[in-house]
């Protein structure tokens, strides 16, 4: 039977009742245009939602839009439109909301072709109210806040100028003309590309790159011939074109881009390029892409430095630059990403990583599934994950794969069953232990979230029909109930709960359609009923991560160390609660060659430990840049794997001798940086 | 030459189940997915699902789902169909097709279909009480 | 599921004159689709494949057109043989679908 229908699946006692006590409908009085909404601050159950409407007039577009108030999770909204003087809000900017609990929030504003500046409107107090402030340029990007100070904003303008504001918005500066590109790095720095001769696409590869550490009033160019640059992590990476060629490579400071160093890894053609998949304070992971439209390429990791890299997958799906890849960081289990490839057949596979792209493998087979017509062999297949890829390629797949760093272990996504993702429609699948293991929790594309830390799962079938039932599950999704939310059937457009998957409400979105008119209309359900008792000590039991072979003394150690949580017990019907936080109890492994990854001029042969000399290098000394000078190094092939903890056990020697020697081949290196100040 | 012979004629009570068979020849058999479309008296074509026969792997139809099981014969070069809980509106004419796309996704060069190239001659089914 | 639609459901058409055959389908399909043939107590027979590529042995006055949603199968100067009924499939995503059949008949 399907999941959920087996007789031994316990009802939640008397659950429509509670549900129905805690269903709250909000229909916004609006034609149905798009809507737009925004969580602002944590834990504060303040939403700001934005509808738009556009008429098509014979000359022009008349837009109108209303902004929505609510305060208590999305239950009830007040119109506050009138705080925002009526005024048309443009969409393509979003709402931009202030980093943690700041309450700040901006508003950018549609403007008539002839003002001199573009309109915002501003507040500080979580949108009870709003400052209108008139701006001495056009925007072209949306407001973006320093991590470290909401006070502090820099936009681009559609002049190409870098604008800062050091009072949220209230006052405007104009630091840098012909900027392409702009970020905060920390410590409230910014780094940004400027052009020298025409427009940002005419210089592309001769731009220069500077920083400003004082918002404005100095700079210093930290780089030139630079193509793209980016921010990963504790990592400032840039794309910097070759002396001769049309090829570029990347180099890599951790210093805010004082010291650059040459990235050990492929340089790129024109039609190529780079991408940061994902990037921590230990490491990188960096796919390149193939030569010619191959739609692929391959992922290499980085080592502390992000200097020496290690191919980590071959024929890594990745479309174009700025296209689909379905890289996904598993946030509910340590060391856990997902992606997928393209196989010789041009059929797409889907690999998984537990140790930090070490390892790669096929995801097992759910044990309640059978291969699909893909399979080559009906006993032997995998599961396959569907992400951003089938998203863009319209399959059946309404939501991209699901964690949550509080919901320990838990992954949710559409896939199927065979040797390939497959055309027909998915089903969505769980996984308890951050991937190694997985089962079928519905039939059918739906759309799902995760409340109270992982206690409740809510999911709604896809479909394009009407729809009025919500589905939702107390054990991570082996047993589910279904709960009619309201008689009238709506189109349904989404789900929307707090980020971070503490809260216990959940907003269906959707618009109603008469005759006459169509309106947005939303059904906020709090599920704090269902879960009536808090959770005490004996709701929770120890789960070791990563564990594989109980018998073994090293079962669950990756990266150097294990972890045992404390997990909740399916069976248990509680509150985590709000204030949740995850418990851990970490213990240190001793090292073993798999804690090391191959150094510069080593590599791994597959399905072997041991690193070995890259033939090609053989009997030459190992010679690399590193800050621009020429490095030797001594080496018997392994480093530590970035954020390894392992003590003792295996221990290769490894030495860097500095041979006082300029490197010829760095564009980044000190003497070709400059200073200036405004 | 290539050709898909079905079983013959079969007259079913409702609730029973009928299995039709489809032999394949002058091809390699395992290098070809199998489909299954019926057809009824009057009406268009109806895609009921797939079977890879290299590991008998199947995708059906929502519609069919529970009641259909396609499977295959390595050694017979032959693929059958059989269709459980029969009613009156299973009242069809059954045709194997050689699909030899399959059903993978494919990468961003874009899945090339080529049809159901080649077709059985059918298996007419009348459930009636 | 992909729905397919195919109009007109009925063409009336002279030897030697041309016919044109529409499809539409309810979302992009891309160039995943085929065209085929089926004359009473026959098994349907395919025409064309990746929306516009003549299979193996099939006569050049039939040709096809289109991609995402919108098909056309061209018969560029009927014969006698060639009064039959026409479907289009998708097979783009699962289930596989056919459009509900365009009868050419003579006028």
């Known amino acids: 039977s399907a999941p959920g229908e087996d007789e031994e699946c316990g009802r939640v006692r008397d659950f429509v009742a509670k549900l129905a006590n805690n269903t709250h409908q909000h229909v916004f009085d609006d034609l149905r245009g798009s809507v737009s909404l925004s969580w602002v601050g944590d834990s504060t159950g303040v939403i700001l939602v934005l509808t738009t409407f556009h008429v098509p007039l014979v000359i022009m577009t008349f837009g109108q839009s209303k902004l929505y108030r609510s305060e208590d999770y999305g239950k009830n909204f007040k119109d506050i439109t009138d705080l925002i003087n009526n005024t048309f809000i443009r969409t393509e900017f979003g709402m931009a909301i202030g980093p943690e609990n700041s309450g700040k929030v901006v508003l950018t504003a549609e403007v008539s072709g002839g003002s001199r500046g573009g309109r915002i409107f501003r507040s500080s107090d979580f949108a009870k109210n709003f400052v209108q402030t008139d701006l001495p340029f056009h925007p072209l990007t949306q407001m973006m806040y320093s991590p470290q100070n909401s006070d502090y904003l820099l936009a681009l303008s559609t002049e190409n100028g870098l604008w800062v504001s050091k009072n949220f918005g209230g006052k405007w500066e104009e630091i840098h003309k012909a900027v392409c590109l702009a970020k905060w790095g920390s410590d409230n720095t910014i780094f940004f590309t400027t052009y020298a001769n025409g427009s940002c696409k005419a210089d592309l590869g001769a731009l220069e790159l500077w920083r400003t550490s004082d918002l404005g009033k100095s700079f210093k160019t930290i780089g030139v011939k630079i193509y793209s640059f980016g921010l990963g992590g504790r990592f400032l990476f840039a794309s910097v074109m070759a002396d001769k060629d049309t090829t570029r490579r990347i180099h890599v400071s951790t210093d805010q881009g004082d010291t650059w160093s040459m990235a050990q890894l492929p340089s790129v053609g024109q039609e190529q390029f780079y991408s940061i998949l994902a990037a921590n304070d230990d490491m990188v992971f960096m796919h390149v892409d193939e030569p010619g439209d191959t739609g692929f390429g391959t992922i290499f990791t980085s080592d502390d430095r992000g200097i020496v890299y290690s191919k980590s997958l071959d024929r890594h799906l990745y479309t174009t630059t700025g296209g689909e890849t379905d890289f996904t960081n598993v946030t509910s289990l340590r060391g856990v990403y997902i992606t997928s490839v393209l196989s010789e057949d041009n059929s797409i596979q889907t690999m998984i990583t537990f140790d930090q792209g070490g390892r790669w493998t096929h995801l097992r087979k759910p044990e309640n599934s059978e291969c699909d017509a893909t399979a080559k062999n009906k006993n032997e297949c995998s599961l396959h994950i569907h992400a951003s890829y089938s998203i863009s390629q319209k399959l059946n797949v309404p939501m991209a794969p699901l964690s949550e760093p509080n919901a320990v272990g838990i992954v949710i996504a559409h896939g199927s069953v065979g040797d390939a993702i497959s055309v027909m429609v998915p089903d969505v699948y769980i996984s308890d232990d951050g991937g190694y293991s997985w089962t079928k929790m519905l039939e059918g594309p739906h759309y799902y979230t995760i409340l109270d830390s992982g206690g409740i799962i809510v999911a709604i079938e896809h479909s394009s029909r009407p729809i009025n039932v919500i589905k939702f599950s107390t054990d991570e999704g082996q047993c589910w109930q279904t709960y009619t939310f309201t008689r009238d059937p709506i189109y349904f457009t989404g789900l929307a709960s707090e980020p971070g998957a503490r809260s216990m409400n959940i907003s269906i979105w959707g618009f109603t359609e008469s005759f006459l008119t169509s309106q947005w209309v939303s059904y906020t359900i709090d599920f704090k009923d269902i879960l009536e008792r808090n959770c005490e000590e004996k709701d929770y039991t120890i789960w070791l991560a990563h564990s594989t072979d109980p018998e073994d003394y090293e079962d669950g150690c990756i990266l150097g160390y294990k972890e045992q949580f404390l997990r909740l017990r399916k069976s248990s019907v509680c509150q985590n609660g709000r204030d949740y936080v995850v418990t851990k109890q970490p213990s240190i492994c001793l090292c073993s060659l798999e804690d090391f990854l191959c150094d510069f001029g080593y590599y791994r042969p597959e399905n072997d430990s041991k690193c070995v000399e890259q033939p090609e290098l053989k009997g030459h000394d190992l010679e690399f840049c590193l800050y621009g000078r020429e490095e030797h190094l001594t080496t018997n092939g392994y480093r530590k794997i970035p954020g390894d903890k392992c003590q003792g056990g295996v221990n290769p020697v490894r030495e860097v001798k500095d041979l006082k020697k300029k490197c010829t081949s760095n564009f980044l290196s000190p003497e070709k940086q400059n200073s200036k100040s405004n | 030459q290539v050709q898909l012979v079905q079983s013959g004629a079969e007259v079913k009570k409702p609730g029973a189940s009928v299995k039709v068979s489809c032999k394949a020849s002058g091809y390699t058999f395992t290098k070809y997915y199998m489909s299954w479309v019926r057809q009824a008296p009057g009406q268009g074509l109806e895609w009921m699902g797939i079977i890879n026969p290299i590991g008998g792997s199947t995708s059906y139809a929502q519609k069919f789902q529970g009641r259909v099981t396609m499977t295959r014969d390595t050694s017979a070069s032959t693929v059958y169909m059989e269709l459980s809980s029969l009613r009156s509106e299973d009242t069809a004419v059954y045709y194997c097709?050689?699909?030899?796309?399959?059903?993978?996704?494919?990468?961003?060069?874009?899945?090339?279909?080529?049809?159901?190239?080649?077709w059985g001659q059918g298996t007419t089914v009348t459930v009636s009480s | 599921e992909i729905v397919m639609t195919q109009s007109p459901a009925t063409l009336s058409v002279s030897p030697g004159e041309r016919a044109t055959l529409s499809c539409r389908a309810s979302?992009?399909?891309?160039?995943?689709l085929a065209w085929y043939q089926q004359k009473p107590g026959q098994a349907p027979r395919l025409l064309i494949y990746g929306a516009s590529t003549r299979a193996t042995g099939i006569p050049a006055r039939f040709s096809g057109s289109g991609s995402g949603t919108e098909f056309t199968l061209t018969i560029s100067s009927l014969q006698s043989e060639d009064f039959a009924v026409y479907y289009c499939q998708q097979a783009r995503l699962g289930p596989w679908t056919f459009g509900g059949g365009t009868k050419v008949e003579i006028k």
């Open positions: 979302q992009s399909v891309s160039s995943n």
């Open positions: 097709a050689r699909d030899p796309s399959g059903i993978a996704a494919a990468g961003p060069a874009g899945r090339y279909y080529y049809g159901m190239d080649v």
